[in-house]
């Protein structure tokens, strides 16, 4: 075998809704023939599977061989190095991979304007991964909340921020005009998954959005 | 929303050492990581490093690899830059940016909530 391969120093999964992305980062001085290794585990099933003999790139999307991770205890994943015959020792994900540590996003955030109010429609990730009855609203079927962060351009950064349990909220301007500016984060209120914030969204309020009423 | 904040640039002789910043302002930071992007004129942005948030771990561009270390101390919500052995291909515009998906961490479209930049020069 020669001298011994070093091992990737670090390996994790990153992950939102079906996009399961497994990182480690690069050994030390590594030659332009280094390749990496990766290999599978599935909880309830104790063997290794070969998921990539030679990936060239520092990450490898698992989205396709992990779809039914919202229905399983979970998955490690194992990564070494590979230089022609010579191999490093395995670096295992060194936490379970399971729905815990997906982190939550927003498809997007739709606003409009009536009669004074910006009313908001979060639409949900609807990846194209995902089989067709694994909906993000089957699979976090309850508890779902938002945390609407509203930021008034120009402004000084200052923010009101509002925590809502449906996927349409309204916010009310107090009589103000300008471009407001929405940020969405999602939680499951009975899970521990972190949250994302969306990215954010502007819609301009003029006087002519308000009716006069007597 | 989330603001990103780079200082510590300025004007430096080649094989002289700079150290930069990047604070995160606005709320606690919680993306996955922060990576530094650096822009020479006429040039297109590219990936000058970056780092994971939780498990520290690092990334180079093979130009910077063995000369610069990127760092992060999560309680101040900051990323540092060290640069040393500076060359005059070092000189750019140095742009801070979070990770906000799961994708590379060598991919532009992994990041977002961009930074103002800060100069970097450094003259032979």
């Known amino acids: 075998h020669g001298t011994e391969l070093p091992s990737p120093p670090s390996v994790w999964f990153e992950a939102e809704f079906f996009h399961h992305i497994l990182h480690w980062t690069p050994i030390p001085n590594q030659s332009e023939s280094t390749c990496y290794e990766v290999a599978l585990l599935r909880y309830g099933i104790e063997s290794w599977n070969s998921i990539s003999n030679c990936s060239q790139t520092l990450s490898y999307d698992l989205t396709a061989v992990t779809l039914d991770l919202y229905h399983s205890n979970g998955y490690r994943a194992r990564v070494r190095a590979v230089d022609g015959s010579r191999h490093s020792n395995w670096t295992v994900t060194n936490t379970r991979f399971s729905v815990d540590e997906v982190t939550l996003t927003v498809g997007s955030v739709n606003l409009e304007i009536h009669n004074g109010f910006i009313l908001g429609k979060i639409q949900l990730p609807r990846p194209k991964m995902a089989p067709a009855n694994d909906t993000y609203e089957s699979i976090f079927s309850h508890f779902r909340e938002y945390e609407i962060a509203i930021r008034k351009v120009p402004g000084n950064f200052t923010f009101t921020h509002k925590k809502v349990k449906h996927e349409n909220f309204s916010l009310l301007t107090s009589g103000e005009v300008g471009e407001f500016c929405v940020q969405v984060k999602p939680s499951v209120a009975s899970r521990s998954n972190k949250g994302m914030w969306s990215k954010e969204e502007c819609i301009s309020l003029t006087r002519q959005y308000f009716t006069v009423t007597n | 929303q989330l603001q990103l904040v780079e200082s510590g640039g300025g004007l430096v002789q080649a094989g002289g050492s700079l150290k930069l910043s990047c604070t995160a302002s606005?709320?606690?930071?919680?993306?996955?990581?922060m990576g530094w992007f650096r822009q020479a004129p006429g040039k297109e942005r590219e990936f000058v490093s970056a780092i994971n948030w939780i498990y520290g771990a690092t990334y180079y561009a093979d130009s910077v690899k063995g000369r610069f270390a990127v760092s992060r101390d999560k309680a101040k919500g900051t990323m540092y830059l060290q640069m040393n052995s500076l060359k005059p291909e070092d000189t750019a515009v140095y742009y801070c940016?979070?990770?906000?998906?799961?994708?590379?961490?060598?991919?532009?479209?992994?990041?977002?909530?961009w930074g103002q930049g800060t100069q970097v020069t450094v003259s032979s």
């Open positions: 940016a979070a990770k906000i998906n799961a994708g590379s961490y060598f991919n532009i479209g992994s990041f977002g909530s």
């Open positions: 606005g709320r606690t930071f919680d993306g996955y990581g």
